[in-house]
Interface confidence: low
């Protein structure tokens, strides 16, 4: 621990002190530096502030002091392992008072009522007071008058100037003052007395239709004298007329855009085509918004949204019925539908497309399809602007040709039954096929149960009268051709148990 000794002539001047100390034990790691700290027991007891660091081979330094601080010093030695224990503290040195060297910063003037101005600033830290107390000399005058300054000395970090006119610019100065004098000549800040609601009404220059869902709105800059405050910008509010449902208690949904003060146009996008809109533009300041200029406009027709809920219904091996609902968003007057389709495994070749010119149409029958192919069907509604977004479905009339046509086929078993389940494909024609359960093992002699006729649409089949604890092969036939095989084993003891609820049996 370094032993701190203040030299006899410690105060070299009123603002400098010489501090010396005896070297610290280095404990086999050289002292790299000494940190000289001070505490002011009057203003900030128990808080130590660094005044500076000096190299480890130095045992004294001259420190620059601030006015009116009760300095108590200590020194800490630092080596590569970190700081040691601080030295005992010195006697207290009190520097003489002096006039402030700094003024408050962050000076602002703004009204919180229409007829006042509140002047605020960041108070000086105690280290900058240079005396036991500090006050603030606040000066103000209307900008541009070059007339006399009004002034007041206050202790609080604010001053309310009352009885001002609405939104007048003021020159403001705030200077630190203590018993020894004043701080530097303060910088002039411009503040404003309180704002009132704007009286300016933006004058609309016009609305340019960009497309069926976007418009450009333009207006003339407002007269700043009518803003009664700092123009912060413009509030643009718009809503679709007739968007309030009849007998609905819900409010009309209004959209808002805030436009900066230096901009006098805005693009409104995401509008619904073929709709009437109401528009309001208001100037606003810190107090609020002024009166609105109003306008109505209509968006032109656009392309419609996608048709709803396209279903495929198999009519025969070669024909499908398409069934749909019209789009939720017409975006204009519907003129009909466009239907396109192509076989999936032909790489998009062979696409057929035709117009259905009846907007009231909800179904269409397709014939001459190949029974062995899957198709991609695409349906679009149309307005005079053209076809809209498509709804897409895949399917076909194809006859069963392997396990993939069943989708997720599985079998489970109880003691004397087995349930075979599958997921029918949408658009697949219903057909009938055989299921055959064949017992395995020597003692069973490979006995088969009678083949059962099953409908594809029923999605499951339960086979009863099986032997407990027996392996079965399940064979699926269609038109006497073997299509699929799977295996299942029944449970133990032969007690009869019912299958789970909800399974169809034949």
């Amino acid at each position: 621990v370094p032993r701190l000794v203040l030299s006899d002539l410690h105060l070299l001047t009123q603002s400098q002190v010489r501090v010396s100390w005896s070297p610290a034990e280095d404990h086999n790691a050289p002292i790299e530096k000494y940190d000289i700290e001070f505490e002011d027991k009057e203003m900030a007891p128990e808080k130590w502030y660094s005044l500076g660091k000096v190299p480890g081979n130095q045992t004294s330094t001259t420190l620059k002091l601030s006015p009116y601080v009760h300095y108590t010093f200590r020194v800490t030695a630092i080596n590569k392992y970190g700081p040691g224990e601080p030295s005992p503290v010195s006697e207290t040195v009190v520097t003489p008072e002096a006039a402030p060297e700094k003024n408050p910063v962050d000076v602002k003037g703004e009204g919180n009522e229409t007829t006042n101005m509140v002047i605020t600033w960041k108070p000086l830290r105690w280290m900058d007071w240079n005396a036991p107390q500090v006050q603030y000399r606040v000066q103000w005058r209307p900008q541009g008058t070059r007339g006399p300054w009004q002034e007041q000395i206050v202790s609080d970090p604010f001053l309310v100037v009352s009885n001002t006119s609405t939104f007048v610019p003021y020159e403001i100065k705030v200077q630190a003052v203590n018993s020894q004098g004043k701080g530097p000549e303060p910088q002039v800040t411009i503040g404003y007395s309180g704002e009132d609601y704007p009286q300016a009404i933006p004058e609309l220059e016009g609305i340019e239709i960009l497309n069926s869902s976007a418009v450009l709105v333009k207006w003339r800059p407002v007269d700043l004298a009518q803003v009664k405050g700092h123009l912060r910008g413009y509030n643009v509010t718009y809503w679709r007329e007739g968007s309030q449902r009849k007998h609905s208690k819900r409010h009309i949904h209004k959209d808002h855009v805030v436009v900066p003060a230096n901009t006098t146009s805005v693009i409104l996008s995401g509008l619904r085509p073929y709709s009437s809109y109401h528009l309001e533009v208001q100037a606003f300041n810190g107090r609020g918004s002024g009166p609105a200029s109003e306008f109505t406009f209509s968006t032109p027709e656009g392309v419609p949204g996608h048709p709803e809920a396209l279903h495929l219904e198999c009519q025969s091996n070669t024909s499908l019925l398409l069934r749909w609902q019209p789009p939720l968003s017409h975006n204009g007057v519907l003129t009909g539908y466009v239907l396109s389709y192509h076989p999936l495994d032909e790489g998009g070749k062979g696409q057929l497309s035709f117009n259905l010119r009846d907007p009231e149409l909800r179904t269409h029958n397709l014939t001459d399809l190949s029974p062995h192919l899957r198709y991609r069907f695409q349906l679009q509604a149309t307005t005079k602007e053209g076809p809209g977004e498509a709804i897409v479905r895949e399917g076909g009339t194809m006859a069963l040709s392997g396990i993939s046509d069943f989708g997720n086929i599985s079998a489970t078993a109880g003691e004397n039954y087995s349930v075979v389940s599958w997921v029918p494909k949408e658009g697949q024609c219903n057909f009938r096929f055989h299921i055959l359960f064949k017992a395995l093992g020597e003692e069973k002699g490979g006995a088969s149960l009678s083949p059962q006729y099953v409908s594809y649409n029923q999605s499951s089949y339960t086979q009863w009268d099986l032997q407990p604890d027996t392996d079965y092969e399940i064979h699926l036939f269609k038109e006497r051709m073997f299509r699929h095989q799977m295996a299942v084993k029944t449970n133990g003891t032969g007690r009869v148990r019912l299958p789970p609820a909800g399974f169809a049996t034949e």
Partner: antibody, heavy 118, light 111 residues
Framework: QVQLVQSGAEVKKPGASVKVSCKAS????????MHWVRQAPGQGLEWMGN????????KYAQKFQGRVTMTRDTSTSTVYMELSSLRSEDTAVYYC???????????WGQGTLVTVSS | NIQLTQSPSSLSASVGDRVTITCRAS??????????MHWYQQKPGKPPKLLIY???NLESGVPSRFSGSGSGTDFTLTISSLQPEDFATYYC?????????FGQGTKLEIK
């Protein structure tokens, strides 16, 4: 009106020191910070530091710390800038400058050319 | 240290032209609701002259064809219609943070 008048040109050898003065008039000398800015030939402006005549407080740019000293004499309303251990790259015009009522250096001295040459 | 980068470094223009000089700071120079950025004009052999203080305020006695704008890190000095006496070097300067720093300068020459 505010006036800042600087001392005349100096020629110094490397390693020497130079002391430039700036005499202020037309305002309350102790109320405004005074700054020093230098400009090497054909180069831009470089802030060196400042001094507050009211108390003698100083603030120096890190680059000049240890080589520059700024002082004031309130009896003659003069500030001084002393630069030691001169090198050839210290050849420059040295300006004193004072902020206006708002911000920015509104008032400048006429400049002092310091030439460092062996 | 806050670095200030001016662009362009030099430009040629004619009397009557509108000229824009930009200054980009390596970090924000905004504090207390103000932008501590200033613009100066300097002619050969003369000290700099303050044109714009606090980003957008015209110094007393400076012609209104000079204007400043910007906040945070991006600032612009605009001369709306060049006059013969405007051909000079222009500097931006910040004093939001020590050390106070200047841009490298933009030399405006006659075309």
């Amino acid at each position: 009106q505010v006036q800042l008048v600087q001392s005349g040109a100096e020629v110094k050898k490397p390693g020497a020191s130079v002391k430039v003065s700036c005499k202020a008039s037309g305002y309350t000398f102790t109320s405004y910070w005074m700054h020093w800015v230098r400009q090497a030939p054909g180069q831009g402006l470089e802030w060196m530091g400042n001094v507050y005549p009211g108390s003698g407080s100083t603030k120096y740019a890190q680059k000049f710390q240890g080589r520059v000293t700024m002082t004031r004499d309130t009896s003659t309303s003069t500030v001084y800038m002393e630069l030691s251990s001169l090198r050839s790259e210290d050849t420059a015009v040295y300006y004193c400058a004072r902020p206006g009522n708002y911000e920015g250096f509104a008032y400048w001295g006429q400049g002092t050319l310091v030439t460092v040459s062996s | 240290n806050i670095q200030l980068t001016q662009s362009p470094s030099s430009l040629s223009a004619s009397v009557g032209d509108r000229v824009t000089i930009t200054c980009r700071a390596s970090e924000s120079v905004d504090s207390y609701g103000s932008s501590f950025m200033h613009w100066y004009q300097q002619k050969p052999g003369k000290p700099p002259k303050l044109l714009i203080y606090l980003a957008s305020n015209l110094e007393s006695g400076v012609p209104s064809r000079f204007s400043g704008s910007g906040s945070g890190t991006d600032f612009t000095l605009t001369i709306s219609s060049l006059q013969p006496e405007d051909f000079a070097t222009y500097y931006c300067q910040q004093n939001n943070e020590d050390p106070w720093t200047f841009g490298q300068g933009t030399k405006l020459e006659i075309k």
